[in-house]
């Protein structure tokens, strides 16, 4: 999906109002210094690409993030503010339903969400103005 078509300011607002709080809730009890940020992004559409990948693509040791509250709100924000995003995700969602596993918060998941927090912070930094 080409994230350059998204309404970045609306997604930023969604992040600041709810997604950020849900990420903090997920990470509660974890020290902010516990994990090093190893995933970076160059600009807003790149940040969204990495955020989508880390949030919705199951990885070794962490297969359950897509069902978390922050993930569902991320999906909703992208569906609303990125034209055509929902259509591109239909097949991916169907494939994910088949792979779904029991919801477990592992250390790997905590590390992954810590990376997500860093990507979201980076997303919020640029002042990319829409003309």
């Amino acid at each position: 999906y080409d994230f350059t078509n998204c309404d970045f300011e609306k997604i930023k607002a969604a992040y600041l109002s709810t997604i950020s709080k849900d990420l903090i809730t997920y990470m509660s009890g974890t020290k902010s210094t516990e994990f090093n940020n190893t995933v970076s992004c160059s600009n807003r559409p790149h940040c969204l690409t990495e955020i989508q990948s880390l949030t919705f693509n199951p990885t070794a040791g962490c297969a359950s993030l897509a069902k978390e509250m922050f993930a569902m709100k991320t999906k909703a924000a992208l569906a609303i503010w990125c034209p055509g995003y929902s259509e591109t995700q239909i097949n991916a969602t169907q494939a994910m339903k088949k792979r779904r596993k029991r919801k477990v918060t592992t250390n790997k998941c905590l590390e992954q969400v810590s990376q997500l927090q860093g990507l979201w912070r980076r997303f919020n930094r640029p002042l990319l103005k829409q003309q």
């Epitope: 350059t4 078509n5 309404d7 160059s42 600009n43 790149h46 690409t49 034209p83 829409q130």
Partner: antibody, heavy 122, light 107 residues
């Protein structure tokens, strides 16, 4: 093979208007953002404008904001730059360039046309 | 607007030598810096993006590095065809500014 061919350049008087076109081929035009970049004679590169693949997001350099309008027609594989209220300092070769369009390539220009010369003079 | 300052303005070296070109940004743009090569009468050519990623088909002698506000393009051993003007560009935030360029000339 990716090809970008600019046209529409020429001599115009200060305060006049010009419309540049860029014909794209060799790739799925509707999937890529596009840029206009200019280069004054003997000078460096200056980014002018960007339009996303679906025209949802458009950005301009401060020097052209309010005077230039970027647009695209995905059905015609064409990019445009409408230039109004032209000034002598707008004299340059205008390049159309394709955006890298993925992950670390966003807002990077990976393919360039040969350029079209715009001269603003009385 | 993010300002990119390139140095030196001109670099005079001989084939076989190592070239180091600098690009400094007015604020943190890491890692969103690209490098382009332009030869007289030709369009620019993408070399490096996201500070250190070599673009398809670019020879291995070209490498990019840096973070924060300081970025470097290195050409390990100059070939005759490398003498040209080099521009850095930030692809972090609109307006997507270029540096003023470094001219790499034969000594």
């Amino acid at each position: 093979e990716v090809q970008l061919v600019e046209s529409g350049g020429g001599l115009v008087q200060p305060g006049g208007s010009l419309r540049l076109s860029c014909a794209a081929s060799g790739f799925t035009f509707s999937s890529f953002g596009m840029h206009w970049v200019r280069q004054a004679p003997g000078k460096g590169l200056e980014w002018v404008s960007y339009i996303s693949s679906g025209s949802s997001n458009i950005y301009y350099a401060d020097t052209v904001k309010g005077r230039f309008t970027i647009s695209r027609d995905n059905a015609k594989n064409s990019l445009y730059l409408q230039m109004n209220s032209l000034r002598a300092e707008d004299t340059a070769v205008y390049y159309c360039a394709r955006d890298g369009g993925s992950r670390r390539h966003y807002y990077v220009m990976d393919y360039w046309g040969q350029g079209t010369l715009v001269t603003v003079s009385s | 607007e993010i300002v990119l300052t390139q140095s030196p303005a001109t670099l005079s070296l001989s084939p076989g030598e190592r070239a180091t070109l600098s690009c400094k940004a007015s604020q943190d743009v890491s890692p969103a810096v690209a490098w382009y090569q332009q030869k007289p009468g030709q369009s620019p050519r993408l070399l490096i993006y996201s500070a250190s990623y070599r673009y398809t088909g670019v020879p291995a002698r070209f490498s990019g590095s840096g973070s924060g506000t300081d970025f470097t393009l290195t050409i390990s051993s100059l070939e005759p065809e490398d003498f040209a003007v080099y521009y850095c560009q930030q692809h972090y935030s609109s307006p997507f500014t270029f540096g003023q360029g470094t001219k790499l000339e034969i000594k």
